[in-house]
Amino acid sequence: MAVTACQGLGFVVSLIGIAGIIAATCMDQWSTQDLYNNPVTAVFNYQGLWRSCVRESSGFTECRGYFTLLGLPAMLQAVRALMIVGIVLGAIGLLVSIFALKCIRIGSMEDSAKANMTLTSGIMFIVSGLCAIAGVSVFANMLVTNFWMSTANMYTGMGGMVQTVQTRYTFGAALFVGWVAGGLTLIGGVMMCIACRGLAPEETNYKAVSYHASGHSVAYKPGGFKASTGFGSNTKNKKIYDGGARTEDEVQSYPSKHDYV
């Protein structure tokens, strides 16, 4: 039961995390105009990974896409790549983890196969979360560097007569969404990996015990619980006899009126 809960929770947390990574990647507020210690403008600038926007006091917002690929800073391209890789890995991880969920039965899929799929999706979520955190952190670092550079030469003028105020940018909402989302995806991935261990019980060496029931004897042989290493079914590891004694996980793996496919 605890394994199923851990796996389910890991899936939900990762799902929220990946939705957040997608949202952050699409958001326009990766960097926003710094209003602190600046002349108050009737125009507010903010920038995303794909376009930059200007919101006027009039309420009019104008956004322009970055229609060049070669002209963009390498760091911005790197951040884009990291976020996209994070989304792709996360999406594949979600797909794999759906089939790996213990509460969903697909044909006669072994618990061992589900364990492997859970581990695979968990690793994918961890890498996805790390990609998002790395992408957001690289962008944040770029902002901090540019902020202090523009602060150093904030006022550039001709003989001190005419001043040009450089627009400084600070952290936008997307950065915080990205950090949180990346963290959630990472946590979800760790939970999936933990659930994987519970899904694939280690080999238990039971002593052979004889049960005498109505004149004939049936023996339980050891080795019936060996973990599978592949995605396919492993017939070698099936129990010889299905008696009345079952483990908690076994009970759940058989269809009942409470199972929904």
């Epitope: 002349p39 403008t41 125009v43 930059s52 009039s58």
Partner: antibody
Framework: QVQLVQSGSELKKPGASVKVSCKAS????????INWVRQAPGQGLEWMGW????????TYAEEFKGRFVFSLDTSVSTAYLQISSLKAEDTAVYFC???????????WGQGTLVTVSS | DIVMTQSPDSLAVSLGERATINCKSS????????????LTWYQQKPGQPPKLLIY???TRESGVPDRFSGSGSGTDFTLTISSLQAEDVAVYYC?????????FGGGTKVEIK
């Protein structure tokens, strides 16, 4: 078409208060800000500030903070300018203007002359 | 506050001649985000409210005759009336539409010579 109609001229004594109205029509009132501009006799234009009808948020120019208050009644699409403790130097024509994109004042009221005299 | 300085204070031009009004701001009105200059030009005739002519330094408001044109960037701007007509006699104001307060220039009075 967009129209801003202001209240009529006012003659007030020093120390009194006055409330100038600016009724908007021909557009969605809450979508665009209302600016107030003062023009003293024979002088240039002075931007007083503006009010956002969507949020009720106000921005005042430094010299118009205190005695000057912008308000709204969105149910009748009207903006108000209230001036308290009137002084002789408040004698001017007060204009309301709609803030349109490009931060431009595309429509103006006809102006309200406020005369402060003892 | 941003100071808007207009020159000349008054200008007398013959009908059909070119009239040029200059406006200088104490800080750049160019917004890096959209590369637009937030400068607006208004025309005010006696006893009337101001009328919008040009916004974003060079974009003509609809209904404004094409003899009116705006140019310039950063801190230096110009309003040009290519062929002065009798109805163009008025006071012209430039306005900073970028920084609060949204200050106006002192105005330039255009008359017929």
């Amino acid at each position: 078409q967009v129209q801003l109609v202001q209240s009529g001229s006012e003659l007030k004594k020093p120390g009194a208060s006055v409330k100038v109205s600016c009724k908007a029509s021909g557009y969605t009132f809450t979508n665009y800000g209302i600016n107030w501009v003062r023009q003293a006799p024979g002088q240039g234009l002075e931007w007083m500030g503006w009010i956002n009808p969507n949020t009720g948020e106000t921005t005042y120019a430094e010299e118009f903070k205190g005695r000057f208050v912008f308000s709204l009644d969105t149910s009748v699409s009207t903006a108000y300018l209230q001036i308290s403790s009137l002084k002789a130097e408040d004698t001017a024509v007060y204009f309301c203007a709609r803030l349109y994109y490009g931060n431009r004042f595309d429509s103006w009221g006809q102006g309200t002359l406020v005369t402060v005299s003892s | 506050d941003i100071v808007m300085t207009q020159s000349p204070d008054s200008l007398a031009v013959s009908l059909g001649e070119r009239a040029t009004i200059n406006c200088k701001s104490s800080q750049s009105l160019l917004n890096s985000g959209n590369q637009r200059n937030y400068l607006t030009w208004y025309q005010q005739k006696p006893g009337q409210p101001p009328k919008l002519l040009i916004y974003w330094a060079s974009t003509r408001e609809s209904g404004v005759p094409d003899r009116f044109s705006g140019s310039g960037s950063g801190t230096d701007f110009t309003l040009t009336i290519s062929s002065l007509q009798a109805e163009d006699v008025a006071v012209y104001y430039c306005q900073n539409a970028y920084y609060y307060p949204l200050t106006f220039g002192g105005g330039t009075k255009v008359e017929i010579k």
